[in-house]
């Protein structure tokens, strides 16, 4: 637009002029005026501020609490907040990984489609016909049920979702 | 304070190219656009175009629509101005300057608060 | 594209006189209109914005009026370091264009 009608992109409007934002990582001071230009600060250590801005306090960096399960994934900046992530067997609660909880396990006969992270918990499936789980676990996959036909055997026990196929010698009495 | 301080001056042959620097301090760089102005020895004042140092976008006048090139790098605070194709009257100094905005009566007012002190670049066989 | 038609183009003057320059704009620009002040071998200095806004550390001798397509710089009483070529540059449409310039001499 010719000519302007607003203050450019990184611009803030405070009396009557159009002042420059802090740049990520630091915080304001003082506003522009006729004579002087914008002032701003580089955030203190464990503070951060990650957009343009006109902010007079830069925020804290997120604490990554171990009492909670927490543990720092990636060191915050001036720029950037601190990333926390869950320890070992456990995954966070929300989006915002504020606590932790132990990751699920899938119970008999169900198995494992998706493996636990940091963020997000283990996703069971019921074991489909011809497969079965016999454990509590948060890792093992529906195992398939033995081929008693390759062993040259004969299922003596159907098999579950839960348990496997018993195979036994076949009839020789039979014709 | 603020300051805009230009390279220094060049002599170029026709169909050459110059690239003018324009190093500013004092300000955020990326917070206020740059135009560029030129000169022809006691002549007036030709405006040329702008960059938004934030995103690195540019806006030509059309008379210098596919010949000048306007860029930026944020990391050194420094915007440039490459014309090509030079002709002698290309010949001028050419200047950088800081938009200001003003709101006044509901409307956004720019001007150019400040200016680097010129590059003169000659262009001659 | 607009046309800026300053004048005078030359005009010599005296210390302590009472200076005008106009500046008449080929279309209408409502009050986008700014003043330059530029001596030998220097770069031009923003002395009014706005058509009449005084620009931070500039002289209260300086005063800028009008708008739509006729403007004017009055300087009050010259100074000698007033001595100097001024250009209005309108800011309402592409390209921004100046004024050819005023130069002001002694007399």
């Known amino acids: 637009p010719e000519p302007p009608t607003a203050c450019r992109e990184k611009q803030y409007l405070i009396n009557s002029q159009c002042c420059s934002l802090c740049q990520p990582g630091q915080k304001l001071v003082s506003d522009c005026t006729e004579f002087t230009e914008t002032e701003c600060l580089p955030c203190g250590e464990s503070e951060f501020l990650d957009t343009w801005n006109r902010e007079t306090h830069c925020h804290q960096h997120k604490y990554c609490d171990p009492n909670l399960g927490l543990r720092v994934q990636q060191k915050g900046t001036s720029e950037t907040d601190t990333i926390c992530t869950c320890e070992e067997g456990w995954h966070c609660t929300s989006e915002a990984c504020e606590s932790c909880v132990l990751h699920r396990s899938c119970s008999p006969g169900f198995g494992v489609k998706q493996i636990a992270t940091g963020v997000s918990d283990t996703i069971c499936e019921p074991c489909p016909v011809g497969f079965f789980s016999n454990v509590s676990s948060a890792f093992e996959k529906c195992h398939p049920w033995t081929s008693c036909e390759t062993k040259d055997l004969v299922v003596q026990q159907a098999g579950t979702n839960k348990t496997d196929v018993v195979c036994g010698p076949q009839d020789r009495l039979r014709a | 304070q603020v300051q805009l301080v230009q390279s220094g001056a060049e002599v170029k042959k026709p169909g050459a190219s110059v690239k003018v620097s324009c190093k500013a301090s004092g300000y955020t760089f990326a917070g206020y656009y740059m135009y560029w102005v030129r000169q022809a020895p006691g002549q007036g004042l030709e405006w040329m175009g702008w960059?938004?140092?934030?995103?690195?976008?540019?806006t030509y006048a059309q008379k210098f629509q596919g010949r000048v090139t306007m860029t930026r790098d944020t990391s050194i605070s420094t915007a440039y101005m490459e014309l090509s194709r030079l002709r002698s009257d290309d010949t001028a100094v050419y200047y950088c300057?800081?938009?200001?905005?003003?709101?006044?009566?509901?409307?956004?007012?720019?001007?150019?608060?400040?200016w680097g002190q010129g590059t003169l670049v000659t262009v001659s066989s | 594209d607009i046309q800026l038609t300053q004048s005078p183009s030359f005009l010599s003057a005296s210390v302590g006189d009472r200076v005008t320059i106009t500046c008449r704009a080929s279309?209408?620009?409502?009050?986008?209109l700014a003043w330059y002040q530029q001596k030998p071998g220097k770069a031009p200095k923003l002395l009014i914005y706005a058509a009449s806004t005084l620009q931070s550390g500039v002289p209260s001798r300086f005063s800028g009026s009008g708008s739509g397509t006729e403007f004017t710089l009055t300087i009050s009483s010259l100074q000698p370091e007033d001595f100097a070529t001024y250009y209005c540059q309108q800011l309402d449409s592409y390209p921004w264009t100046f004024g050819q310039g005023t130069k002001v001499e002694i007399k």
């Open positions: 960059i938004n140092p934030d995103s690195g976008a540019p």
């Open positions: 279309q209408g620009i409502s009050s986008y």
């Open positions: 300057a800081r938009e200001k905005i003003y709101y006044g009566s509901g409307n956004y007012y720019p001007s150019f608060d400040y």
